[in-house]
């Protein structure tokens, strides 16, 4: 148990996470994350599972955020915009979208970079997982600091 | 000591800051900030130093954020995108990038405005400083509310 | 009083809100919100009033945020960029801008989507209200998760 755990007492430990994007060869729209670089994982009350979802053990209000930087070109992409979605999977419930952001592709060649930030306060149940979905993971930028995902319990 | 200090008791005072961008004639890529307008500086456990960095006295987890609005034009700018970086300098450690966002320049004339938002949870050591670096400070918009920087201790 | 209220004790209840955008036929630049979908309203210490402002009962530091997704076209819009503003109305004070973000209109046809995120720490007085203003509400996207508004008390 690390130092964050004790700061607020055993009954109300600090719970927070910040994970870093990881390039993936998987053909899935769900982004992959890793505990690497300057990451945060306060204690075992929040965990990164399968490299793709942050799962919490305690019910409560959480501020959840994600940042996605991507590089795309209008001609090389579908007509639909690049969309990043913050999604929730609670035990016994269907997945649902919490937040979305959309950016039209750039006309810059070979591609134009753009950044999206999502964030909001949501109630999570014990065992709930949050994850980030994008329209085209191959366009996501994985350079230092460009794409990250995290939460903090209020 | 102001009213925020006491709300959570002497042992765990509220620590938060929100500072406002300031135009600078300095030839540096580090943005300048001021305690002006509707700013926040909860107490002396966080300080704005040299108008450029927020420095904390206590170790812990902090949600740190920055917003940068800029106006640029593709033809008048370098080919590289506009990049805003949230950076950390801890005592005895090298500066490092915590978060970055990138936006390709607009084709609008004379320039097109765009806004970037960065935010994440990070552990800071006593004496650690965070600051914001951009590729071209002359493109940053300093109108009311457009560009700001802050943190809060969890 | 719901479960969030009790978590930190009667003296220091958890205060947070997250509301969802609502299309409006009103010819006002102030966005409309609703307690619908996956919304948050921790207790009666924060309320959504007239569908347009979040009003707090207790003085203190709050992290306030808004996300606005919009779809616009350069030719069909005014030359001015799309601007989203987070504004404050305190009792006995004039309204003021806390945060703003600006994005130049897209050249995509019929319109190009873009997302703006605003967020910062501010002191609010009892009875203070925060609201979101945009240059053209008709351009705002109201699909699931695209446009939202919230706060949390530190």
């Amino acid at each position: 148990e690390n130092s964050f755990e004790m700061q607020k007492g055993d009954q109300n430990p600090q719970i927070a996470a910040h994970v870093i994007s990881e390039a993936s060869s998987k053909t899935t729209s769900v982004l992959q994350w890793a505990e690497k670089g300057y990451y945060t994982m306060s204690n075992n009350l929040v965990t990164l599972e399968n490299g793709k979802q942050l799962t919490v053990k305690r019910q409560g209000l959480y501020y959840i955020y994600a940042q996605v930087t991507f590089c795309s070109n209008r001609e090389a992409s579908s007509q639909a915009p690049f969309i990043a979605s913050l999604c929730l999977k609670s035990p016994g419930r269907f997945e649902r979208i919490l937040l979305r952001a959309a950016n039209t592709h750039s006309s810059a060649k070979p591609c134009g970079q753009q950044s999206i930030h999502l964030g909001g306060v949501f109630e999570l149940q014990p065992g709930a997982s949050v994850f980030v979905n994008v329209t085209d993971p191959s366009q996501v930028s994985h350079g230092t600091g460009f794409t990250s995902f995290g939460l903090l319990k209020l | 000591e102001n009213s925020f200090e006491m709300q959570k008791g002497d042992q765990n005072p509220q620590i938060a800051a929100h500072v406002i961008s300031e135009a600078s004639s300095k030839t540096t890529s580090v943005l300048q900030w001021a305690e002006k307008g509707y700013y926040t500086m909860s107490n002396n456990l966080v300080t704005l130093e040299n108008g450029k960095q927020l420095t904390v006295k206590r170790q812990g987890l902090y949600y740190i954020y920055a917003q940068v609005t800029f106006c640029s034009n593709r033809e008048a700018s370098s080919q590289a995108p506009f990049i805003a970086s949230l950076c950390l300098k801890s005592p005895g450690r090298f500066e490092r990038i915590l978060l970055r966002a990138a936006n390709t320049h607009s084709s609008a004339k004379p320039c097109g405005q765009q806004s970037i938002h960065l935010g994440g949870v990070f552990e800071l050591q006593p004496g650690a400083s965070v600051f914001v670096n951009v590729t071209d400070p002359s493109q940053v918009s300093h109108g009311t509310g457009f560009t700001s920087f802050g943190l809060l201790k969890l | 009083e719901n479960s969030f209220e009790m978590q930190k004790g009667d003296q220091n209840p958890q205060i947070a809100a997250h509301v969802i955008s609502e299309a409006s036929s009103k010819t006002t630049s102030v966005l409309q919100w609703a307690e619908k979908g996956y919304y948050t309203m921790s207790n009666n210490l924060v309320t959504l009033e007239n569908g347009k402002q979040l009003t707090v009962k207790r003085q203190g530091l709050y992290y306030i945020y808004a996300q606005v997704t919009f779809c616009s076209n350069r030719e069909a819009s005014s030359q001015a960029p799309f601007i989203a503003s987070l504004c404050l109305k305190s009792p006995g004070r004039f309204e003021r801008i806390l945060l703003r973000a600006a994005n130049t209109h897209s050249s995509a046809k019929p319109c190009g989507q873009q997302s703006i995120h605003l967020g910062g720490v501010f002191e609010l007085q009892p009875g203070a209200s925060v609201f979101v203003n945009v240059t053209d509400p008709s351009q705002v996207s109201h699909g699931t998760g695209f446009t939202s508004f919230g706060l949390l008390k530190l």
Partner: nanobody, 129 residues
Framework: EVQLVESGGGLVQAGGSLRLSCAAS????????MAWFRQAPGKEREFVAA????????DYSDSLKDRFTISRDNAKATLYLRMNNLKPEDTAVYYC??????????????????????WGQGTLVTVSS
């Protein structure tokens, strides 16, 4: 690539002062963390002081911070070390070192030699009693 050339060394009496310079050429030194190390005869090279690339924040060896001051002039692409109240035990070859800002090595600490990518040839400082 960055080339580093130190100068300003020499013979000085105890209690005296010196200012060392390190001229950087090649890629823009604005993008580099800079530091001074020193190596006394028969001893290992040790950290003296460092200055960060963006903020210009300084870090010092605890034993030297009261007498030595590191600074940089980005316009001149030059790093400096001002040494006051010199002592015979300050006799050493003083080396300038640089590390790229974007470089992420196994070391994150400014006082570790292995963290630096580029080194000068050194300048000798001799303090007589």
């Amino acid at each position: 690539e960055v080339q580093l050339v130190e100068s300003g060394g020499g013979l000085v009496q105890a209690g005296g002062s010196l200012r060392l310079s390190c001229a950087a050429s090649g890629r823009t030194p604005l993008n580099y963390h800079m530091a001074w190390f020193r190596q006394a005869p028969g001893k290992e090279r040790e950290f003296v002081a460092a200055i960060s690339s963006l903020l210009g924040s300084t870090d010092y060896s605890d034993s030297l911070k009261d007498r030595f001051t590191i600074s940089r002039d980005n316009a001149k692409a030059t790093l400096y070390l001002r040494m006051n109240n010199l002592k015979p035990e300050d006799t050493a070859v003083y080396y300038c070192a640089a590390r790229e800002t974007t470089h992420y090595s196994t070391s994150d600490r400014v006082n570790e030699m292995r963290a630096y990518d580029y080194w000068g040839q050194g300048t000798l400082v001799t303090v007589s009693s």
